[in-house]
């Protein structure tokens, strides 16, 4: 049994038909010695009476908010989660795997620049009595802080039958160093708690790894004189780390004709223009990716040739 | 060229180099969505690798401000990778493909470190551990690990030189 | 879903040579290292050969086939061979394409993997 926080404590159990559970003493938090009585949750069933109560928790039921009283009166409360391990593996009831990049995906990152400002999120069909607890550092033997805010519901989605809903939380890093090279990677753990049950999620990764520009902006055509050529030319994103000459990016210049089977004309450069022959109904598109490290594309930004 | 002295180094032509530095990273050892080192071995193998630090003055200001410290770092590093590249951990069991782009950058990394340090002059470089695990497949984790770490590291280089090129050339 | 489909095994002499090729289902091919496996009956299961395009690319060959055998493959194919040379009775067993898309050849090299295939019969008479 371990202090989730002050008087919130979880329970770790071995989850198996007929597992013999975990002996938990509780102790009343008072200078009292006499008189006290013990109830669970909502009942007015006396479970026990002293300064400590023992009990035997095996299953959910055995689960809730331990209070002792003196005489009509509550003395403290004591509040008992679960954490469910089975076969060696703690659950993951809570959360949905998110199964990309890889499976056992439950949280997802990315940053727009390497300010060491990140967002994670996750996905779960839960919609009431949830919580959730954001911490984090950069490596864990000796680790350097990073300021996480609340999670928010941040999304809802119809999937089918159910609807799923989207947490997000914004991290920071207490004292980032854009220019370096990371060693040590970012850790983010977040502890989730539905009714009675608890299980914690982490992920750990370096800020290069999750970075995700965002997409080009002022993206504009330009036709050139005779010719069923236009000049493209966009912008660096405002998000994007300064100065640019520094922090570079490269471009994947697309044109794409109204049907998706249409061959796709793909252009990649350096630069924040390139030249490009417009056909009919097609649209021009641009993406941007940290020029010297393999990270994510942004998304696409878009016109219309016409 | 960065001589210990203090001179300018050949920005465009570092710039060029690193840049193509990070391209042969990437091609020796591609980004695989679903892949996480950190899922290979527990073991940290990887520790040893010189990084580009804060303090090592690689960003814009410090390099406006001394750019020598930067590129000691940066030569210590292409010094300690071409050793690397050059040992047993990729010279032994499993063979590199004939096509590998395990050579070129090998090469690219002695190269750059040349036009940073031309000969006769010495900065103190790191020694090498001495990793030469005895099973294939350890040796091909080892690779992994060291690429990936490369990759971060000619990174950070090629920004080095890309500004250096754009606002510190003569 | 990876799915594996051998073929070009069959029945040769001592000395012979046979090639046979593996077709892999998904585009996750060149992610991933591929290899060849073989199994005798009665006997424990035995690493052939594998090729991978991580960590520089690599080329492995099991201790018995070294010299003998030659592992490639055609990414555009989505395709892996092995061409086996101075086949001897003892390289009879079945042979089996495998894939490892998690740790791209590490899996293979410890002699384990994601996927295999259904496998191919190899008989090597005297």
């Known amino acids: 049994i371990w202090e989730l926080k002050k008087d919130v404590y979880v329970v770790e159990l071995d989850w198996y038909p007929d597992a013999p559970g975990e002996m938990v003493v509780l102790t009343c938090d008072t200078p009292e010695e006499d008189g006290i009585t013990w109830t669970l949750d909502q009942s007015s069933e006396v479970l026990g009476s002293g300064k400590t109560l023992t009990i035997q928790v095996k299953e959910f039921g055995d689960a809730g908010q331990y209070t002792c009283h003196k005489g009509g009166e509550v003395l403290s409360h004591s509040l008992l989660l679960l954490h469910k391990k089975e076969d060696g593996i703690w659950s993951t009831d809570i959360l949905k795997d998110q199964k990309e990049p890889k499976n056992k995906t439950f949280l997802r990152c990315e940053a727009k620049n390497y300010s060491g400002r990140f967002t994670c999120w996750w996905l779960t069909t839960i919609s009431t009595d949830l919580t959730f607890s954001v911490k984090s550092s950069r490596g864990s033997s000796d680790p350097q802080g990073v300021t996480c805010g609340a999670a928010t519901l941040s999304a809802e989605r119809v999937r089918g039958d159910n609807k799923e809903y989207e947490y997000s939380v914004e991290c920071q890093e207490d004292s980032a160093c854009p220019a370096a090279e990371e060693s040590l990677p970012i850790e983010v753990m977040v502890d989730a708690v539905h009714k009675l049950k608890y299980e914690n999620y982490t992920s750990s990764f370096f800020i290069r790894d999750i970075i995700k520009p965002d997409p080009p902006k002022n993206l504009q055509l330009k036709p050139l004189k005779n010719s069923r050529q236009v000049e493209v030319s966009w912008e660096y994103p405002d998000t994007w780390s300064t100065p640019h000459s520094y922090f570079s990016l490269t471009f994947c210049v697309q044109v794409q004709g109204k049907s998706k089977r249409e061959k796709k004309d793909r252009v990649f450069t350096d630069k924040t223009s390139a030249t490009v022959i417009c056909r009919k109904n097609a649209s021009i598109s641009v993406r941007a990716q940290d020029r010297y490290y393999s990270s994510s594309w942004s998304e696409w930004a878009s016109v219309p040739c016409s | 060229r960065a001589v210990p002295g203090g001179s300018s180094p050949a920005w465009t032509q570092c710039q060029q180099l690193s840049q193509k530095l990070c391209t042969l990273a990437w091609s020796a050892h591609p980004l695989v969505g679903h892949m996480d080192l950190r899922e290979e071995g527990d073991e940290e193998t990887t520790n040893d690798v010189p990084h580009i630090q804060c303090g090592d003055g690689c960003d814009p200001q410090g390099l406006r401000d001394n750019s020598q410290f930067c590129l000691q770092r940066i030569h210590q590093g292409l010094i300690f990778y071409e050793k690397l590249l050059g040992s047993d951990i990729f010279t032994g069991e499993p063979s590199l493909l004939p096509d590998s782009p395990v050579g070129q950058l090998h090469a690219s990394l002695l190269g750059l470190s040349q036009l940073l340090q031309p000969e006769g002059h010495h900065w103190e470089t790191q020694q090498i551990p001495s990793l030469s695990p005895s099973q294939p497949w350890q040796r091909l984790l080892l690779r992994f690990k060291i690429l990936r770490s490369l990759q971060a590291f000619v990174a950070v280089a090629a920004r080095v030189f890309a500004h250096g090129a754009a606002t510190l050339s003569p | 879903e990876v799915q594996l489909v051998e073929s070009g095994g069959g029945l040769v002499q001592a000395g012979g040579s046979l090639r046979l090729s593996c077709v892999a289902s998904e585009r996750t091919f060149s992610s991933s290292a591929m290899g060849w496996f073989r199994q005798a009956p009665g006997k424990e299961r035995e690493f052939v050969a594998a090729i991978g395009w991580s960590g520089g690319g690599f080329i492995h060959y099991g201790d018995s086939v070294k010299g003998r055998f030659t592992i490639s493959a055609d990414n555009g194919k989505n395709t892996v061979y092995l061409q086996m040379n101075s086949l001897k009775p003892e390289d009879t067993a079945v042979y089996y394409c495998?894939?490892?898309?998690?740790?791209?050849?590490?899996?293979?090299?410890?002699?384990?993997?994601?996927?295999r295939g259904q496998g191919t019969q190899v008989t090597v008479s005297s």
């Open positions: 495998a894939a490892d898309s998690r740790l791209r050849g590490i899996a293979l090299l410890k002699g384990s993997y994601d996927y």
